[in-house]
Structure formats: C-alpha cells, structure tokens
C-alpha cells in the first residue's frame, strides 16, 4: 500500500496524478479533497466498492490502459459529481449498468478497447442524461449493436463506435439518439454500412467513417422512408477505395441533400481515374457541397492516371478545396476552368513547380479565387510565381511559405488585388520592390533578413520574427502599421521615440531578442505603463543579454546602479 501511495501526487486543487507507474490497485486513503484522479498506464486489475467511496467531489477519473477486469457493482456509487470517466483499453468483458447509474453528472465516457462482445444486457446509458461524449467498441470482439444499446440518449456532441469487426446490427439501434453532432464509426468491412447510414442520416450532423475497405462497396437503393438528412459533413479517414467504388460512394452521398463538406484523410485510391462517364453524368449530382478536403491521399498507380474530365462538371459549385500532401504536381487547366465558384484553394505540401502551375492557372482558371495556398511545394522563383498567377484577377491572399526562393528580384508582377503575402521560411536574405505595394499583411518570418527598408504604404501587419534584424524597421515606411511581430531577431534595443513613430501601432511582439539593458532602455521599458498593452509578450520574453551579470533576467526586474550603467 505504501508504495502505491507514493506513486500518487496531488496538488492543492485536488488534481492527483499517478499515471505510468506500477500501481496494482487504487491507492487507499483518497478523500473528498480529490477532484481529478489520473491512474492511467498502471497495473490495476480490480476496483472495489470501497476504493473511491470517499471521493464525493471527484470530477475526473482516468483509468485507461490498466488491466482492469473487474469493477464491483457499487464502485462508483458515491461519484455523483463525476463528469469525466475513462475506462478505455482495459479487460472489461462484461459491462454493467449499475456502474453508471449513480453518475448523474457524467458528460464524458470512454469504454473503447475493452473485450466486450456487446454493450450488455440492459441499456447502459439511459441514466446518463448529461452525457456529451461517448466512446464504445473495440477492434475485434465487439460484433453486435443492439436496439437497446443507446436507449435514453437524446443528444450527444460526439459518439465514437469502434465497430471494426461488426457482424450484426439491429435496425434502428442508432436511430434512438435524436441528435449527434459528430459520429465516428470504425468499420473494417462495409457490409452493414448502408443499414447504419439509414438510421443516422436524420440525426447526425458530421459523419466520419474510419479504417474501412470500400474497394468492393456497392450502393443499393436505400429503404429509407425519409430523405430528410441532417448530415452536413462526411469524412472518410483511412478508407480504401477504387475507381468503381468511388462512383458508388458518390451515389451514397447523393442521398444526403444538405451535404456541405466532404473530407478524405489518409485514404488510398486504388485506381487510374477510370470514372465511367455515362453513369456519372446520369447519377451524380454534387448537390450543395461547398468544401472538399483531401489530405495525404495515396494513389499507388498515380502515374497511370488519365482522364478526370468526367468529374469536372461536379466541381462547379465548390467554394473551398484543400488537397494537401497528396503528390499533386499539376491541376489540369480544364479542371481549373470548371472551378467557377472556387474562392479558396490549398495545395500545401505538394509538388508544384512554376512551369506546371502555369498550366493550372491558365486563362479563365479559378475565376473567383481569392486565396491560394502553395505552402511547401517546389517553387523556386518568386518572379515566375507572381507572373504565373497574373491570370487570377480576384486573388488577394497568397501563401507560398516553405518554398526555397533564396533570392528576390528587384521587381515582380503580382495580381493587382493582392492584400496578403506569406513568404515565411523561404530562405530569402533580402526584401526588394518585388513585394507588392498593395499588401496589407506580409509574413517574412523565419528567413535570413538583416534589413527591412521597404515602403509599404498600406501594410497593416508585418510578421518578421526569426530573422537577423538589428533594429526596428523605419516607421515612416510603414505608416499604416497596426501589428509588428519581430521576436527572435538580433535587436539590442529600441527607444520610446522609435515606438512613438509608429503612430498606428497597436501590437508589438519583440521578445526573444538580445537586449542590452542600458539605463536608458531599462528606464524606458520599466516606466512606460502603457507599454505592457502594446508588447503582447511582455514581460516573459524580454530578457537582458548584457551586462553579463544580468544576462537571462527579465528586463522588467533588472535594476542597475548608475555606476554600472552600460551605455550603447
């Protein structure tokens, strides 16, 4: 017992931590003072009626990843204040409703990864009227969802069901929950997908399907009496799909009248772009989908891809597209021209070069585009990039950060409405007239700049942290500046006069520099009460670099005698 006790530490607020130890039981002597108890990653196998008896004020109990195989009936009887209970990844093979009955305040319950076959003989959750987040199921033994399983639950913020190996689904089992903001469904096979889909379509706002092999998925007409679908967003995560089954999935999505957002994360497309035109044209209507997000799409036969033109007509109403980290090196001109409503395009972490971008941003491409993100691609010339984008008349925001530009030419051409340009982490060592005068926001942080002397009359925000600047920029060149972030440079000092010359400045972040704590600098920074309002990272990030005996101390705390003043 004593070693058990020693593994637990509690602070004055009753937050007790005892995770990742060698506890084999719940420590004795726990009292009403305990508000939160984390005993995850231990070797607890048994919870008795008396273990938590005095913890009447306990609000959070985390017992994940122990070896719990037995919980006595009344173990949680005094936990009326408990809001968060995590019993995931233990060895509970039978769930008892008596455990949960007293937990009238519970908002979060995680039962994932326990080896139960079903959710018990009676309705487990019917007394949990405040429950918001529920996670149930496991990867292998949870094979059956029954109609009574979710009885009594009317509203859930999030419901996660690991039904990886589901073999039986009793119709209407999930229909009893009137509203679920986010349903996460892990299913290896798709055999029961349509049955579940029918039940959740009118109660779930955001549906997420995980780890499913849809290679052989075939859509058959739904036997749903209602087409009143609540689903606004459908996410496919780690799902396998083929050309043919993608078409079948699109037929399924057709049933969701109010679908606004479609997301594919970490999915694999085993195909070559062979989408059958005749069927597609006849059946597929993209409905109201406005946002399409694709992240880390894996296409094993990527270079065999051929004609995607059958899908072009489906894209005309889409307003936001993200295709991130999916080895995209070219967006066909024709597709770009079809994306008539597109306002936001994020192609981060792909393989775009200027010459192929030219094909993508052809005449009449993306006519409504306002924001283009090409972060971390293979762009190498600012001049070529700007010139390539001249066709995009409505473009105002461009993010080309994390491309290696190195140098910047003296002049460049850019779309005339440009307001925002992100050139952070592009290895540039100087800024020139290449930067458009129309900018309101410029981010050149994390580069090799030692000078900033550009006149940008409309600039409101300048992000220039993590460079090599030795002084603040000349305020007269930036008459409209509201925000200046210039932390982690080589600035040694700044004066009241310098700050005052930025007439419109509301926010300055200048911490992490090598401040010489001279008398002048200390008196200015310590006496100006208003300074703390402007310096958003004051005082924590303002440290003296010299004199040596105050190095590392916060500027606001340093006191120097007149005799040791370090004049700059």
């Amino acid at each position: 017992e004593s070693s058990n006790q020693a593994s637990l530490s509690c602070d004055r607020n009753g937050i007790c931590k005892g995770s990742s130890g060698s506890l084999n039981s719940i420590p004795s002597g726990l009292t009403e003072a305990v508000k939160s108890l984390d005993l995850s990653n231990n070797r607890i196998t048994y919870i008795s009626n008396s273990d938590l008896q005095r913890c009447v004020n306990l609000q959070a109990l985390v017992l994940t990843s122990n070896g719990i195989n037995t919980i006595e009936e009344d173990s949680f009887s005094s936990l009326g204040s408990l809001e968060h209970l995590d019993l995931s990844y233990n060895y509970l093979s039978n769930l008892s409703s008596s455990w949960f009955k007293p937990l009238s305040s519970l908002t979060f319950l995680n039962l994932l990864g326990n080896p139960y076959k079903t959710l018990g003989e009676t309705s487990l959750f019917s007394h949990l009227t405040k429950l918001q987040i529920l996670r149930v199921g496991n990867m292998d033994t949870f094979t059956k969802i029954q109609r009574k399983d979710f009885a009594g639950l009317t509203f859930l913020e999030e419901l996660e069901i690991d039904a990886s190996d589901l073999q039986s689904y009793e119709p209407k089992s999930l229909k009893s929950i009137q509203n679920v903001s986010h349903l996460i469904l892990h299913m290896k096979q798709h055999i029961l997908l349509l049955e579940i889909f029918v039940d959740v379509t009118s109660s779930v706002e955001c549906l997420e399907l995980r780890d499913t092999d849809l290679d052989t998925f075939h859509f058959s007409e739904l036997s749903t009496g209602e087409t009143n679908s609540l689903i606004k967003k459908f996410t496919f995560r780690n799902v396998k799909i083929t050309d043919e089954s993608l078409f079948q999935v699109m037929k399924l999505l057709n049933q969701i009248s109010g679908l606004l957002e479609l997301e594919f994360d970490d999915c694999t497309l085993n195909g070559v772009g062979n989408f059958r035109a005749s069927d597609n044209d006849r059946v597929i209507d993209p409905g109201k989908v406005e946002t399409l997000t694709i992240r880390r799409l894996h296409i094993p036969r990527f270079y065999l891809f051929y004609d995607l033109s059958t899908l072009y007509s489906l894209t005309e109403r889409v307003k936001r597209i993200t295709v991130e980290n999916s080895k995209v090196f070219l967006v066909p001109c024709l597709l770009s021209q079809h994306l008539k409503s597109l306002e936001y395009l994020d192609l981060s972490e792909n393989l775009m070069v200027e010459e192929y971008l030219k094909n993508s941003a052809c005449e009449d491409a993306w006519p409504s585009l306002q924001t283009l993100i090409l972060r971390q691609n293979h762009l190498a010339s600012l001049e070529k990039t700007g010139e390539t984008l001249l066709t995009l008349k409505n473009l105002t925001n461009i993010d080309i950060s994390k491309n290696s530009f190195h140098s910047m030419p003296e002049t460049c051409q850019w779309p005339e409405k440009m307001k925002y340009l992100n050139l952070s982490s592009t290895r540039i060592h100087s800024v020139t007239g290449c930067i458009p005068k129309t900018l309101e926001i410029l981010d050149v942080s994390n580069n090799n700049l030692n000078l900033f002397s550009l006149n940008l009359p409309q600039l409101k925000e300048l992000y220039i942290s993590r460079n090599k600047l030795m002084t603040l920029p000349d305020a007269s060149l930036l008459p409209m500046l509201l925000v200046l972030k210039i932390s982690r440079n080589a600035i040694t000092t700044f004066s009241k006069e310098q700050l005052d010359s930025f007439h419109t400045l509301k926010t300055l972040e200048a911490g992490g520099n090598n401040f010489i704590c001279s008398c002048e600098f200390l008196s200015f920074t310590q006496e100006q009460q208003a300074l703390a309002k402007v310096l958003i990272d004051w005082p924590a990030n303002y440290l003296c670099d010299s004199p040596s005996h105050v190095r590392g101390q916060q500027v606001q705390d340093v006191r120097l005698s007149v005799s040791e003043c370090h004049r700059t």
């Epitope: 270079y303 070219l330 070069v353 094909n359």
Partner: antibody
C-alpha cells in the same frame, strides 16, 4: 546550395548485398523525392525507383523490385539503396537524384561505382 | 513500358551550327496539356544534368542555346549555336508512366 553526396566505390562478391548512401544538403529533404538510376558500363540510364522521405512511400521499376530496397533516415537527410543477391550484371554506376515537380531529376549525386566480382 | 527511341545515335555537327536530336515515344506522354518529357546532358565521368523539363521548359542556369519542343510522341532537343562544351551525350526521359524510361542516348561529335 543543393548537393547529393554519394558513398564511395564498392567491390563486392557475387551473392552478397551492398548498401549505397546518398546524403542530401541545401534543401528540405522531406519535401522532395529521391530517385535511383543505374548506368551500366558504356550503357544508357535505367530508372530503379524512388522514395519520398516524408512518408516513406516507394515506387519501383518492376525489373528492380526484388533487387533493390529503398530507405531513408530523415534525421541525417540520407537516402539508402540496398542491392541484394549481387551478380556481375549489377556492376554499374548508381546515381541518386532529387525529384522535383513530381516528374524531373534536377540534381544528381556524383554516382557510386559498384563492382561485383570474385 | 513506354519505349523512347532517340535518333540519331550519334550526330556530327560543326561548331556554331544547329544540332537537333529527336526522341520518339512508343505512346503519348501528354498529361493534361503538359508533355512529361525531359532532356539531360551527360559529360564523361559525370552524372547527367537536367536541361529541359516538360518538353520545353529550360532549367534554371542552362544556357539559352538549348531549347526543347514537341508534344504527344515526338520531341526534339535543339542546340544552337553548338559550342565545344556541348560535344557530349544527351538522353531523353519520360515521366508519364511508370516505370520511367530513358532514351538510348545520342552522342554529339565534331564534324
């Protein structure tokens, strides 16, 4: 500046294996693919395959699927190619090259000469 | 596999004149309006050097006397005017389909 530095020449016995390295510098290693190309004595160029350091994904020429294994160590920005069951047919210069824009090889290593002989 | 046939295998040219090397693909290397065809130069004992990508885009730092043209299956590399430094080996390469393939090479010689 962008550089790919390959390991030195190798003389190995038939049936053995060899691991060639290619150390990258001057660019963000995980952002580009690394390709390997074979050039036999007085011969043309033969594409072996590529690896993307960001996710470790690979693609091979079928002719080399059982011959070559591609790996990366992102912490040292180094790509490796291991060649198995070597025969005299494998004697060649092996180049690593950076894949840009998904389609072209814009920077090449100096090459590693492999000689398989008993 | 896409087979790339370069012609001629060797080409004798006079310095200052134009040299044209052809590369024919066994099937189209077009990808949505872009020809995925590259040209490389290789000097003895050195790795290949990229000259042209996407059939006609000249790689940064490559002299303007090099140009590429063509689409579909027929491509050519032009060098004008030829300089002594150019009298080496040239290869075409396609990246439209896996496996990527190279042409057999064309050796430039002085006439």
């Amino acid at each position: 500046q962008v550089q790919l530095q390959q390991s030195g020449p190798e003389l190995v016995n038939p049936g053995a294996s060899v691991k060639l390295s290619c150390k990258a510098s001057g660019f963000t290693f995980t952002t580009y693919g690394i390709n390997w190309v074979k050039q036999g004595p007085g011969q043309g160029l033969e594409w072996i395959g590529w690896i993307y350091p960001r996710d470790g994904s690979t693609n091979f020429n079928e002719n080399f699927k059982d011959k070559a294994a591609l790996t990366v160590d992102t912490s040292s920005s180094t790509a490796y190619m291991e060649l198995h069951s070597l025969t005299s047919e494998d004697s060649a210069v092996y180049f690593c090259a950076r894949l840009t824009g998904g389609t072209f090889l814009d920077y090449w290593g100096q090459g590693t000469t492999l000689t398989v002989s008993s | 596999d896409i087979v790339l046939t370069q012609s001629p295998a060797s080409l004798a040219v006079s310095l200052g004149q134009r040299a044209t090397i052809s590369c024919r693909a066994s099937e189209s290397v077009e990808y949505y309006g872009t020809s995925l065809m590259q040209w490389y130069q290789q000097k003895p004992g050195q790795p290949p050097k990229l000259l042209i990508f996407g059939a006609s885009n000249v790689e940064s730092g490559v002299p303007v006397r090099f140009s590429g043209s063509g689409s579909g299956t027929d491509f050519s590399l032009n060098i004008h005017p030829v300089e002594e430094d150019d009298i080496v080996m040239y290869f075409c390469q396609q990246s439209r389909k896996l496996p990527w393939t190279f042409g057999g090479g064309t050796k430039l010689e002085i006439k």
